[in-house]
Protein backbone atom coordinates (compact mmCIF):
# COMPACT_ATOMS: atom_id res chain seq x y z
CA UNK A 1 0.00 0.00 0.00
CA UNK A 2 1.33 3.27 -0.74
CA UNK A 3 -0.15 5.75 1.50
CA UNK A 4 2.55 8.05 2.69
CA UNK A 5 4.12 6.04 5.79
CA UNK A 6 5.09 8.68 7.87
CA UNK A 7 2.14 10.78 7.56
CA UNK A 8 -0.15 8.43 6.21
CA UNK A 9 -2.52 9.91 3.56
CA UNK A 10 -3.64 8.65 0.44
CA UNK A 11 -1.91 10.74 -2.26
CA UNK A 12 -4.71 9.90 -4.82
CA UNK A 13 -7.91 10.82 -2.76
CA UNK A 14 -8.23 13.02 -0.29
CA UNK A 15 -11.74 12.36 0.59
CA UNK A 16 -9.86 9.30 3.23
CA UNK A 17 -9.51 8.64 6.71
CA UNK A 18 -6.12 7.07 6.93
CA UNK A 19 -4.24 5.50 9.99
CA UNK A 20 -1.37 3.11 10.46
CA UNK A 21 -3.13 -0.10 11.29
CA UNK A 22 -2.83 -2.02 8.29
CA UNK A 23 -0.94 -5.57 8.25
CA UNK A 24 2.69 -4.38 9.66
CA UNK A 25 1.63 -0.78 11.04
CA UNK A 26 1.10 -0.51 7.08
CA UNK A 27 -1.12 3.20 6.36
CA UNK A 28 -4.65 2.15 5.43
CA UNK A 29 -7.14 4.35 4.05
CA UNK A 30 -10.79 4.15 4.04
CA UNK A 31 -13.42 6.37 1.96
CA UNK A 32 -15.22 8.81 3.56
CA UNK A 33 -19.15 7.87 4.04
CA UNK A 34 -18.89 4.20 2.63
CA UNK A 35 -15.58 3.65 4.85
CA UNK A 36 -14.51 0.94 2.37
CA UNK A 37 -11.12 0.62 1.95
CA UNK A 38 -9.30 2.26 -0.85
CA UNK A 39 -6.08 1.28 -3.06
CA UNK A 40 -4.02 4.58 -2.51
CA UNK A 41 -2.08 3.57 -5.75
CA UNK A 42 -5.03 4.14 -8.21
CA UNK A 43 -7.70 6.23 -8.68
CA UNK A 44 -10.82 5.46 -5.84
CA UNK A 45 -14.10 4.45 -7.81
CA UNK A 46 -16.46 7.15 -8.73
CA UNK A 47 -19.30 5.79 -6.74
CA UNK A 48 -17.29 5.87 -3.62
CA UNK A 49 -16.20 9.63 -4.72
CA UNK A 50 -19.64 10.46 -4.65
CA UNK A 51 -20.46 8.87 -1.85
CA UNK A 52 -17.97 10.77 0.12
CA UNK A 53 -18.72 13.67 -1.63
CA UNK A 54 -22.44 13.44 -0.29
CA UNK A 55 -21.38 12.78 3.54
CA UNK A 56 -18.83 15.59 3.44
CA UNK A 57 -19.82 18.93 4.85
CA UNK A 58 -21.62 21.18 2.07
CA UNK A 59 -19.11 24.03 1.37
CA UNK A 60 -9.68 13.66 -38.29
CA UNK A 61 -9.02 17.43 -37.08
CA UNK A 62 -13.19 17.17 -37.07
CA UNK A 63 -15.29 17.61 -34.05
CA UNK A 64 -17.26 14.54 -32.51
CA UNK A 65 -20.81 14.96 -32.92
CA UNK A 66 -22.41 13.10 -29.91
CA UNK A 67 -24.43 10.43 -31.16
CA UNK A 68 -28.25 10.59 -30.61
CA UNK A 69 -27.84 7.81 -27.44
CA UNK A 70 -25.11 10.22 -25.82
CA UNK A 71 -26.15 10.62 -22.01
CA UNK A 72 -25.06 13.72 -20.28
CA UNK A 73 -25.30 13.78 -16.28
CA UNK A 74 -27.83 16.67 -16.11
CA UNK A 75 -29.12 15.16 -12.61
CA UNK A 76 -26.02 16.25 -10.60
CA UNK A 77 -24.84 14.98 -7.24
CA UNK A 78 -26.74 11.66 -5.73
CA UNK A 79 -26.25 10.03 -2.61
CA UNK A 80 -25.59 6.31 -4.65
CA UNK A 81 -25.31 3.04 -4.03
CA UNK A 82 -22.57 1.35 -4.21
CA UNK A 83 -21.04 -2.80 -4.87
CA UNK A 84 -18.49 -4.20 -2.46
CA UNK A 85 -15.93 -3.67 -5.18
CA UNK A 86 -17.03 0.11 -5.27
CA UNK A 87 -19.09 0.17 -8.76
CA UNK A 88 -22.71 1.83 -8.67
CA UNK A 89 -25.26 -0.93 -8.15
CA UNK A 90 -27.44 -0.68 -11.47
CA UNK A 91 -30.67 0.89 -9.50
CA UNK A 92 -30.21 3.71 -7.62
CA UNK A 93 -32.95 5.07 -5.62
CA UNK A 94 -33.82 7.99 -3.59
CA UNK A 95 -35.17 8.41 -0.07
CA UNK A 96 -38.62 8.96 -1.40
CA UNK A 97 -38.43 5.31 -2.77
CA UNK A 98 -37.78 6.90 -6.40
CA UNK A 99 -35.45 4.46 -8.31
CA UNK A 100 -33.71 4.36 -11.43
CA UNK A 101 -31.03 2.58 -13.37
CA UNK A 102 -27.61 3.82 -13.83
CA UNK A 103 -24.69 2.68 -15.96
CA UNK A 104 -21.42 2.64 -15.07
CA UNK A 105 -20.54 5.60 -14.60
CA UNK A 106 -23.57 6.39 -12.48
CA UNK A 107 -25.34 8.50 -14.97
CA UNK A 108 -29.19 7.56 -15.12
CA UNK A 109 -30.29 6.14 -18.57
CA UNK A 110 -34.27 5.14 -17.75
CA UNK A 111 -36.74 6.89 -16.39
CA UNK A 112 -37.40 7.38 -13.05
CA UNK A 113 -39.66 4.95 -11.24
CA UNK A 114 -40.76 3.59 -8.24
CA UNK A 115 -39.50 0.35 -6.21
CA UNK A 116 -40.83 -1.64 -8.80
CA UNK A 117 -38.29 -0.86 -11.34
CA UNK A 118 -35.55 -3.35 -12.18
CA UNK A 119 -32.35 -2.88 -13.57
CA UNK A 120 -30.99 -6.20 -14.66
CA UNK A 121 -27.43 -5.03 -14.98
CA UNK A 122 -25.13 -2.54 -15.06
CA UNK A 123 -24.63 -1.36 -18.44
CA UNK A 124 -21.02 -0.68 -19.07
CA UNK A 125 -20.00 2.83 -20.56
CA UNK A 126 -17.79 2.56 -23.30
CA UNK A 127 -16.99 5.65 -24.92
CA UNK A 128 -16.76 9.10 -23.09
CA UNK A 129 -16.59 12.21 -25.06
CA UNK A 130 -14.84 14.91 -23.06
CA UNK A 131 -15.53 18.14 -24.71
CA UNK A 132 -13.70 21.51 -23.58
CA UNK A 133 -13.96 24.58 -24.36
CA UNK A 134 -10.67 26.56 -23.76
CA UNK A 135 -9.99 30.09 -22.88
CA UNK A 136 -8.52 32.73 -25.21
CA UNK A 137 -5.17 32.45 -25.86
CA UNK A 138 -2.36 34.47 -28.47
CA UNK A 139 -2.51 31.82 -31.15
CA UNK A 140 -4.27 28.06 -31.25
CA UNK A 141 -2.74 25.40 -29.79
CA UNK A 142 -0.36 23.30 -31.97
CA UNK A 143 -2.36 20.34 -32.46
CA UNK A 144 0.40 17.31 -32.08
CA UNK A 145 1.86 19.12 -29.18
CA UNK A 146 -1.48 19.87 -27.12
CA UNK A 147 -2.30 15.69 -28.03
CA UNK A 148 0.69 14.88 -26.42
CA UNK A 149 0.23 16.71 -23.45
CA UNK A 150 -3.26 15.59 -22.62
CA UNK A 151 -2.30 11.57 -23.39
CA UNK A 152 0.21 11.98 -20.93
CA UNK A 153 -1.98 13.59 -18.50
CA UNK A 154 -4.57 10.75 -18.73
CA UNK A 155 -1.59 7.88 -19.25
CA UNK A 156 0.32 9.53 -15.52
CA UNK A 157 -1.63 11.77 -13.56
CA UNK A 158 -4.89 9.25 -13.85
CA UNK A 159 -2.92 6.45 -14.74
CA UNK A 160 -5.09 5.30 -17.69
CA UNK A 161 -3.66 2.86 -19.93
CA UNK A 162 -2.66 4.55 -23.27
CA UNK A 163 -4.82 2.60 -25.36
CA UNK A 164 -7.93 3.79 -24.24
CA UNK A 165 -7.18 7.24 -25.23
CA UNK A 166 -8.74 6.69 -28.90
CA UNK A 167 -8.12 10.75 -29.60
CA UNK A 168 -8.13 13.99 -29.55
CA UNK A 169 -9.59 16.18 -31.35
CA UNK A 170 -8.90 20.36 -31.68
CA UNK A 171 -10.71 23.09 -33.62
CA UNK A 172 -9.41 26.03 -31.85
CA UNK A 173 -11.19 26.97 -28.76
CA UNK A 174 -12.88 23.15 -28.80
CA UNK A 175 -11.09 20.26 -27.57
CA UNK A 176 -12.13 17.21 -27.64
CA UNK A 177 -11.08 14.06 -25.98
CA UNK A 178 -12.29 10.31 -26.82
CA UNK A 179 -11.85 7.48 -24.33
CA UNK A 180 -13.15 3.94 -25.46
CA UNK A 181 -12.81 0.99 -23.14
CA UNK A 182 -14.75 -2.08 -23.61
CA UNK A 183 -15.73 -4.77 -20.84
CA UNK A 184 -13.40 -7.06 -23.15
CA UNK A 185 -10.05 -4.86 -23.01
CA UNK A 186 -10.60 -3.97 -19.38
CA UNK A 187 -7.81 -5.99 -17.74
CA UNK A 188 -7.66 -6.40 -14.18
CA UNK A 189 -5.83 -3.17 -12.51
CA UNK A 190 -6.66 -1.22 -15.42
CA UNK A 191 -8.27 2.01 -14.40
CA UNK A 192 -12.12 2.64 -15.85
CA UNK A 193 -12.78 5.41 -18.56
CA UNK A 194 -15.65 6.47 -16.01
CA UNK A 195 -13.16 7.12 -13.01
CA UNK A 196 -10.08 8.56 -15.45
CA UNK A 197 -13.21 11.18 -16.29
CA UNK A 198 -14.43 11.82 -13.31
CA UNK A 199 -10.71 12.61 -11.96
CA UNK A 200 -10.23 14.96 -14.83
CA UNK A 201 -13.37 16.94 -14.62
CA UNK A 202 -13.04 17.26 -11.25
CA UNK A 203 -9.22 18.60 -11.63
CA UNK A 204 -10.92 21.17 -14.49
CA UNK A 205 -13.62 22.50 -11.90
CA UNK A 206 -10.38 23.26 -9.71
CA UNK A 207 -12.06 20.62 -7.47
CA UNK A 208 -8.73 17.97 -6.95
CA UNK A 209 -9.21 14.91 -5.54
CA UNK A 210 -5.54 14.25 -5.24
CA UNK A 211 -3.92 14.71 -1.85
CA UNK A 212 -1.89 17.96 -3.46
CA UNK A 213 -1.78 21.07 -2.63
CA UNK A 214 -1.35 22.35 -6.24
CA UNK A 215 -4.11 21.05 -8.08
CA UNK A 216 -3.99 20.30 -11.78
CA UNK A 217 -1.02 22.33 -13.84
CA UNK A 218 -1.93 22.13 -17.29
CA UNK A 219 0.63 23.50 -19.79
CA UNK A 220 1.25 22.60 -23.44
CA UNK A 221 4.73 24.07 -24.32
CA UNK A 222 4.84 26.07 -21.50
CA UNK A 223 1.45 28.05 -22.57
CA UNK A 224 -0.79 26.95 -19.47
CA UNK A 225 -4.00 25.67 -20.64
CA UNK A 226 -7.08 27.38 -19.16
CA UNK A 227 -10.75 25.29 -19.82
CA UNK A 228 -13.95 27.42 -19.51
CA UNK A 229 -16.29 25.28 -20.25
CA UNK A 230 -16.86 21.45 -19.90
CA UNK A 231 -19.37 18.78 -21.00
CA UNK A 232 -18.98 15.01 -20.96
CA UNK A 233 -20.94 12.79 -23.05
CA UNK A 234 -21.84 9.07 -21.83
CA UNK A 235 -21.78 6.51 -24.70
CA UNK A 236 -23.42 2.75 -23.39
CA UNK A 237 -23.12 -0.27 -24.33
CA UNK A 238 -26.90 -0.84 -24.89
CA UNK A 239 -28.78 2.45 -25.62
CA UNK A 240 -29.95 3.93 -22.90
CA UNK A 241 -34.36 3.42 -22.36
CA UNK A 242 -36.04 6.72 -22.09
CA UNK A 243 -39.32 7.23 -22.93
CA UNK A 244 -40.65 9.57 -26.27
CA UNK A 245 -41.84 12.09 -23.86
CA UNK A 246 -38.49 12.83 -22.63
CA UNK A 247 -36.88 12.71 -25.56
CA UNK A 248 -39.25 15.16 -27.29
CA UNK A 249 -39.21 17.12 -24.29
CA UNK B 1 17.03 20.67 -23.57
CA UNK B 2 15.67 18.68 -20.58
CA UNK B 3 18.91 18.29 -18.35
CA UNK B 4 18.85 17.25 -14.91
CA UNK B 5 22.52 17.59 -12.92
CA UNK B 6 23.21 16.65 -9.73
CA UNK B 7 25.81 17.98 -7.21
CA UNK B 8 27.32 17.69 -3.90
CA UNK B 9 28.33 14.56 -4.04
CA UNK B 10 32.18 13.58 -1.82
CA UNK B 11 33.79 11.69 0.55
CA UNK B 12 31.99 11.44 4.16
CA UNK B 13 32.57 9.47 7.68
CA UNK B 14 29.80 7.20 8.39
CA UNK B 15 27.35 8.74 10.71
CA UNK B 16 27.76 12.06 9.29
CA UNK B 17 25.17 13.81 6.71
CA UNK B 18 25.40 15.19 3.11
CA UNK B 19 23.34 16.95 1.28
CA UNK B 20 23.12 16.05 -2.59
CA UNK B 21 21.22 18.39 -5.24
CA UNK B 22 19.72 18.22 -8.69
CA UNK B 23 19.52 21.27 -10.93
CA UNK B 24 16.57 20.58 -13.47
CA UNK B 25 15.97 22.89 -17.08
CA UNK B 26 14.09 22.94 -20.23
CA UNK B 27 10.91 21.66 -18.98
CA UNK B 28 8.28 22.94 -16.64
CA UNK B 29 9.73 20.87 -13.21
CA UNK B 30 6.65 22.08 -11.15
CA UNK B 31 4.76 19.51 -13.02
CA UNK B 32 6.65 16.72 -12.57
CA UNK B 33 7.00 14.43 -9.68
CA UNK B 34 10.91 14.05 -9.07
CA UNK B 35 13.09 10.51 -7.61
CA UNK B 36 16.40 9.33 -6.55
CA UNK B 37 17.55 6.23 -7.84
CA UNK B 38 20.93 4.64 -6.60
CA UNK B 39 23.31 2.41 -7.53
CA UNK B 40 26.39 0.89 -5.56
CA UNK B 41 29.46 0.24 -7.66
CA UNK B 42 29.43 -2.80 -9.74
CA UNK B 43 25.44 -3.41 -8.51
CA UNK B 44 21.93 -2.91 -9.98
CA UNK B 45 19.73 -0.21 -10.01
CA UNK B 46 18.56 0.88 -6.67
CA UNK B 47 15.35 3.65 -6.07
CA UNK B 48 15.93 5.15 -3.40
CA UNK B 49 13.01 8.04 -2.26
CA UNK B 50 10.09 9.51 -4.37
CA UNK B 51 8.21 13.62 -3.91
CA UNK B 52 5.47 14.38 -5.93
CA UNK B 53 5.05 17.64 -7.82
CA UNK B 54 3.91 19.93 -5.45
CA UNK B 55 5.54 18.42 -2.80
CA UNK B 56 2.73 16.50 -0.98
CA UNK B 57 3.45 13.77 -1.35
CA UNK B 58 6.88 11.21 -0.38
CA UNK B 59 7.76 7.80 -0.16
CA UNK B 60 11.22 5.96 0.53
CA UNK B 61 12.74 3.11 0.26
CA UNK B 62 12.59 0.87 3.88
CA UNK B 63 16.60 0.71 3.90
CA UNK B 64 16.47 5.16 4.47
CA UNK B 65 13.50 5.41 6.40
CA UNK B 66 14.04 8.20 8.55
CA UNK B 67 17.54 9.02 7.70
CA UNK B 68 17.23 10.28 4.43
CA UNK B 69 14.87 13.33 3.43
CA UNK B 70 13.44 14.09 -0.38
CA UNK B 71 12.62 17.65 -0.71
CA UNK B 72 12.19 20.46 -3.59
CA UNK B 73 12.20 24.50 -4.66
CA UNK B 74 10.03 24.51 -7.51
CA UNK B 75 10.83 28.23 -7.51
CA UNK B 76 14.69 27.17 -7.85
CA UNK B 77 13.74 24.23 -10.11
CA UNK B 78 15.77 22.43 -7.68
CA UNK B 79 15.64 18.97 -6.00
CA UNK B 80 17.53 17.71 -2.79
CA UNK B 81 18.29 14.68 -0.66
CA UNK B 82 19.13 15.44 2.57
CA UNK B 83 21.08 12.17 3.63
CA UNK B 84 22.09 11.71 7.52
CA UNK B 85 23.21 8.60 9.82
CA UNK B 86 25.36 7.84 6.46
CA UNK B 87 26.74 4.08 6.31
CA UNK B 88 29.09 2.10 4.03
CA UNK B 89 26.27 0.66 2.32
CA UNK B 90 25.33 3.94 1.34
CA UNK B 91 28.03 4.58 -1.05
CA UNK B 92 26.77 4.77 -4.80
CA UNK B 93 26.28 6.69 -7.50
CA UNK B 94 23.31 8.90 -6.82
CA UNK B 95 20.95 10.12 -9.97
CA UNK B 96 17.89 12.08 -9.96
CA UNK B 97 15.24 11.05 -12.08
CA UNK B 98 11.70 12.85 -13.71
CA UNK B 99 8.79 11.14 -13.34
CA UNK B 100 4.97 11.13 -13.30
CA UNK B 101 3.47 14.47 -15.00
CA UNK B 102 1.23 16.21 -12.59
CA UNK B 103 1.95 13.26 -10.59
CA UNK B 104 4.60 10.60 -8.46
CA UNK B 105 4.58 7.63 -9.64
CA UNK B 106 5.68 7.08 -13.21
CA UNK B 107 8.74 5.27 -15.48
CA UNK B 108 12.23 7.58 -15.57
CA UNK B 109 11.88 9.63 -19.07
CA UNK B 110 14.79 12.04 -18.02
CA UNK B 111 18.24 11.19 -15.85
CA UNK B 112 20.74 13.19 -14.39
CA UNK B 113 24.36 12.08 -14.97
CA UNK B 114 24.47 10.98 -11.08
CA UNK B 115 27.05 12.42 -8.58
CA UNK B 116 29.35 9.84 -6.26
CA UNK B 117 28.71 9.73 -2.57
CA UNK B 118 30.96 7.80 -0.80
CA UNK B 119 30.61 6.61 2.76
CA UNK B 120 34.33 5.93 4.47
CA UNK B 121 36.48 6.10 7.63
CA UNK C 1 6.29 -4.93 -0.78
CA UNK C 2 6.37 -6.65 -4.32
CA UNK C 3 9.52 -8.02 -5.93
CA UNK C 4 10.33 -8.24 -9.35
CA UNK C 5 12.45 -11.17 -10.33
CA UNK C 6 14.63 -10.64 -13.60
CA UNK C 7 15.89 -13.79 -15.81
CA UNK C 8 18.43 -14.37 -17.09
CA UNK C 9 20.79 -12.60 -15.37
CA UNK C 10 23.06 -12.70 -17.91
CA UNK C 11 23.49 -13.72 -21.60
CA UNK C 12 25.13 -14.32 -24.88
CA UNK C 13 23.66 -14.11 -28.65
CA UNK C 14 24.98 -13.34 -31.71
CA UNK C 15 24.31 -10.19 -33.75
CA UNK C 16 21.08 -10.38 -35.73
CA UNK C 17 19.53 -13.08 -32.91
CA UNK C 18 16.62 -12.82 -30.95
CA UNK C 19 16.98 -12.23 -27.47
CA UNK C 20 14.14 -11.92 -24.91
CA UNK C 21 14.21 -11.39 -21.31
CA UNK C 22 11.61 -11.82 -19.05
CA UNK C 23 10.86 -9.91 -15.73
CA UNK C 24 7.87 -11.40 -13.38
CA UNK C 25 6.07 -9.46 -10.09
CA UNK C 26 5.45 -11.08 -6.80
CA UNK C 27 2.19 -9.60 -7.11
CA UNK C 28 0.27 -8.04 -9.91
CA UNK C 29 1.09 -4.86 -11.34
CA UNK C 30 -1.24 -4.71 -13.99
CA UNK C 31 0.75 -2.37 -16.60
CA UNK C 32 2.94 -0.60 -14.83
CA UNK C 33 6.43 -1.38 -15.97
CA UNK C 34 9.33 -0.27 -17.29
CA UNK C 35 12.69 -1.40 -19.29
CA UNK C 36 15.68 0.42 -19.26
CA UNK C 37 19.52 0.04 -21.11
CA UNK C 38 22.50 0.60 -19.02
CA UNK C 39 25.25 0.58 -21.33
CA UNK C 40 28.80 0.33 -19.44
CA UNK C 41 29.88 3.72 -17.66
CA UNK C 42 27.46 5.12 -18.89
CA UNK C 43 23.16 6.43 -17.15
CA UNK C 44 20.14 4.55 -17.73
CA UNK C 45 17.88 5.49 -20.94
CA UNK C 46 14.22 4.63 -20.36
CA UNK C 47 13.17 2.11 -23.35
CA UNK C 48 9.64 1.29 -22.88
CA UNK C 49 7.05 2.12 -19.81
CA UNK C 50 3.76 1.14 -19.76
CA UNK C 51 4.60 -2.47 -20.35
CA UNK C 52 4.69 -2.27 -23.94
CA UNK C 53 5.14 1.62 -25.60
CA UNK C 54 8.13 2.24 -26.89
CA UNK C 55 9.50 5.45 -25.82
CA UNK C 56 10.02 7.95 -28.08
CA UNK C 57 13.99 7.65 -29.86
CA UNK C 58 14.08 4.04 -29.29
CA UNK C 59 14.66 1.41 -31.92
CA UNK C 60 12.17 -0.73 -33.26
CA UNK C 61 13.79 -3.74 -32.52
CA UNK C 62 12.82 -3.36 -29.09
CA UNK C 63 9.46 -4.52 -27.80
CA UNK C 64 7.94 -4.64 -24.71
CA UNK C 65 4.75 -7.48 -23.86
CA UNK C 66 3.21 -8.27 -20.66
CA UNK C 67 0.29 -7.41 -18.09
CA UNK C 68 0.13 -8.70 -14.30
CA UNK C 69 2.50 -10.48 -12.96
CA UNK C 70 4.54 -11.52 -16.62
CA UNK C 71 6.74 -9.41 -18.77
CA UNK C 72 9.17 -9.71 -21.32
CA UNK C 73 11.39 -7.52 -23.38
CA UNK C 74 12.51 -8.31 -26.89
CA UNK C 75 15.32 -7.52 -28.80
CA UNK C 76 14.40 -8.99 -32.67
CA UNK C 77 17.50 -8.33 -33.87
CA UNK C 78 20.31 -8.48 -31.69
CA UNK C 79 22.90 -5.34 -32.75
CA UNK C 80 26.47 -4.49 -31.07
CA UNK C 81 25.13 -1.48 -29.45
CA UNK C 82 22.84 -3.29 -27.75
CA UNK C 83 25.77 -4.42 -25.45
CA UNK C 84 24.15 -3.13 -22.04
CA UNK C 85 22.38 -4.37 -18.76
CA UNK C 86 18.70 -3.99 -19.18
CA UNK C 87 15.76 -3.79 -16.45
CA UNK C 88 12.91 -3.86 -15.19
CA UNK C 89 10.89 -1.99 -12.74
CA UNK C 90 7.70 -1.20 -11.46
CA UNK C 91 5.96 2.05 -10.70
CA UNK C 92 2.45 1.25 -10.00
CA UNK C 93 3.46 2.81 -6.90
CA UNK C 94 6.31 2.78 -4.20
CA UNK C 95 8.55 1.32 -4.05
CA UNK C 96 9.20 1.87 -7.38
CA UNK C 97 11.44 -1.30 -7.44
CA UNK C 98 13.55 -2.79 -9.65
CA UNK C 99 14.58 -5.89 -11.03
CA UNK C 100 17.81 -7.35 -10.30
CA UNK C 101 19.03 -6.41 -14.08
CA UNK C 102 20.29 -8.79 -17.12
CA UNK C 103 23.60 -8.16 -18.69
CA UNK C 104 23.63 -8.71 -22.33
CA UNK C 105 26.63 -9.88 -24.04
CA UNK C 106 28.05 -10.40 -27.75
CA UNK C 107 29.20 -13.95 -28.87
Known amino acids: HTAAQDNCTCPTNKMTVCSPDGPGGRCQCRALGSGMAVDCSTLTSKCLLLKARMSAPKNARTLVRPSEHALVDNDGLYDPDCDPEGRFKARQCNQTSVCWCVNSVGVRRTDKGDLSLRCDELVRTHHILIDLRHRPTAGAFNHSDLDAELRRLFRERYRLHPKFVAAVHYEQPTIQIELRQNTSQKAAGDVDIGDAAYYFERDIKGESLFQGRGGLDLRVRGEPLQVERTLIYYLDEIPPKFSMKRLTA | QVQLVESGGGVVQPGRSLRVSCAASGFIFSTYGMHWVRQAPGKGLEWVAV????????DYVDSVKGRFTISRDNSKNTLYLQMNSLRGEDTAVYYC??????????????WGQGTLVTVSS | DIQMTQSPSSLSASVGDRVTITCRASQGISHFLAWYQQKPGKVPKLLIYAASTLQSGVPSRFSGSGSGTDFTLTISSLQPEDVATYYCQKFNSAPLTFGGGTKVEIK
Open chain 2, 51 to 58: IWYDGSNE
Open chain 2, 97 to 110: ARGGYNSGWWAFDV
